[in-house]
């Protein structure tokens, strides 16, 4: 891996398990200043593999609310606006990091957790073709 | 919001800015044990809006490596395998949380950061139509 020179101004760790347990500032810095959120917000409706977004809430997790995509159709929308079952609408999944309260119900102690979320859907050619 | 009853076994916080700064255990718990990663790994190739994945590495970030999707074509692949420019391949973007070393180069001190990543591509009808 890449070796990072240590900054002499780093906080000291009093944790015996260091670097397993670290300090994290929850004041979120948002790097997404150069994007126009309205531009991509309607892809779920305009896609040939449209999807609905479902709210997943868990107070023991940070962020507590995550939106999950669920494809509207098994097939894809064709040029006539009909569902074409020769193609498949499938969810695009991504592994993301969240913070899980540990021990449970603790406001200032967390553990990193990897979860898989469906972000949207795409239209794919079927992996198995039936031959008559 | 939902009020969480505090667990009496929670660690004490010695930080004056509590709950801004919290303790996080970096031993990642993976909740994705019931998924088959190979199942979705070829969607990028089979989609009508196929994409390539580009490695984005930043040693000051955790995770240090993030994969960014870039659509292969401006249009979408039609039934004949050709690019149809009446439709658009667009990236599906998601806001994710990462940890940013703060102060820089510190191994045990981080700040939460929101970044936008392109996860894959979907085929959409154009947002602005030209009228002849």
């Amino acid at each position: 891996g890449i070796t990072i020179p240590r900054n002499p101004g780093c906080p000291n760790s009093e944790d015996k398990n260091f670097p397993r347990t670290v300090m994290v500032n929850l004041n979120i810095h948002n790097r997404n200043t150069n994007t126009n959120p309205k531009r991509s917000s309607d892809y779920y409706n305009r896609s040939t593999s449209p999807w609905n977004l479902h709210r997943n809430e868990d107070p023991e997790r940070y962020p507590s609310v995550i939106w999950e995509a669920k494809c509207r159709h098994l097939g894809c929308i064709n040029a006539d606006g009909n569902v074409d079952y020769h193609m498949n609408s499938v969810p695009i999944q991504q592994e993301i990091l969240v913070l899980r309260r540990e021990p449970p119900h603790c406001p200032n102690s967390f553990r990193l957790e990897k979860i898989l979320v469906s972000v949207g859907c795409t239209c794919v050619t079927p992996i198995v073709h039936h031959v008559a | 919001g939902i009020t969480i009853p505090r667990n009496p076994g929670c660690p004490n916080s010695e930080d004056k800015n509590f709950p801004r700064t919290v303790m996080v255990n970096l031993n990642i718990h993976n909740r994705n044990t019931n998924t088959n990663p190979k199942r979705s790994s070829d969607y990028y190739n089979r989609s009508t809006s196929p994409w390539n994945l580009h490695r984005n590495e930043d040693p000051e970030r955790y995770p240090s490596v993030i994969w960014e999707a870039k659509c292969r074509h401006l249009g979408c692949i039609n039934a004949d395998g050709n690019v149809d420019y009446h439709m658009n391949s667009v990236p599906i973007q998601q806001e994710i949380l990462v940890l940013r070393r703060e102060p820089p180069h510190c191994p045990n001190s981080f700040r939460l950061e929101k970044i936008l990543v392109s996860v894959g591509c979907t085929c959409v009808t154009p947002i602005v139509h030209h009228v002849a």
Partner: nanobody
Framework: EVRLVESGGGLVQPGGSLRLSCAAS????????IGWFRQAPGKEREGVSC????????YYADSVKGRFTISRDNAKNTVYLQMNSLKPEDTAVYYC?????????????????WGQGTQVTVSS
Amino acid sequence: EVRLVESGGGLVQPGGSLRLSCAASGFTLDYYGIGWFRQAPGKEREGVSCISSSDGSTYYADSVKGRFTISRDNAKNTVYLQMNSLKPEDTAVYYCAVAEIYLSGYGCYVDGSWGQGTQVTVSS
């Protein structure tokens, strides 16, 4: 009526210059990112340059960096592509379309339909 109309193409000698215009009607360009794209005979359409809707950031394909400049005039609802030091390999039909720059900055994608385009031919 919503339209994007390209103009300014023509025949030019290698080393020469052209200025392409993309005029919008029926909607305001300042809300949208706009890109210039080109398609040479027998080749796939490719991104040349884009300008972002949000912060005015720009993208240029490696093949045109330092030679082409994209700009926008919101008052005239027009986006321009100034092309200098033209080469024979720049010969193509040039299109403008509603577009946005990838988060990584390495390219742009289209989120709109295409106009008729304008032919640029670089030949001696």
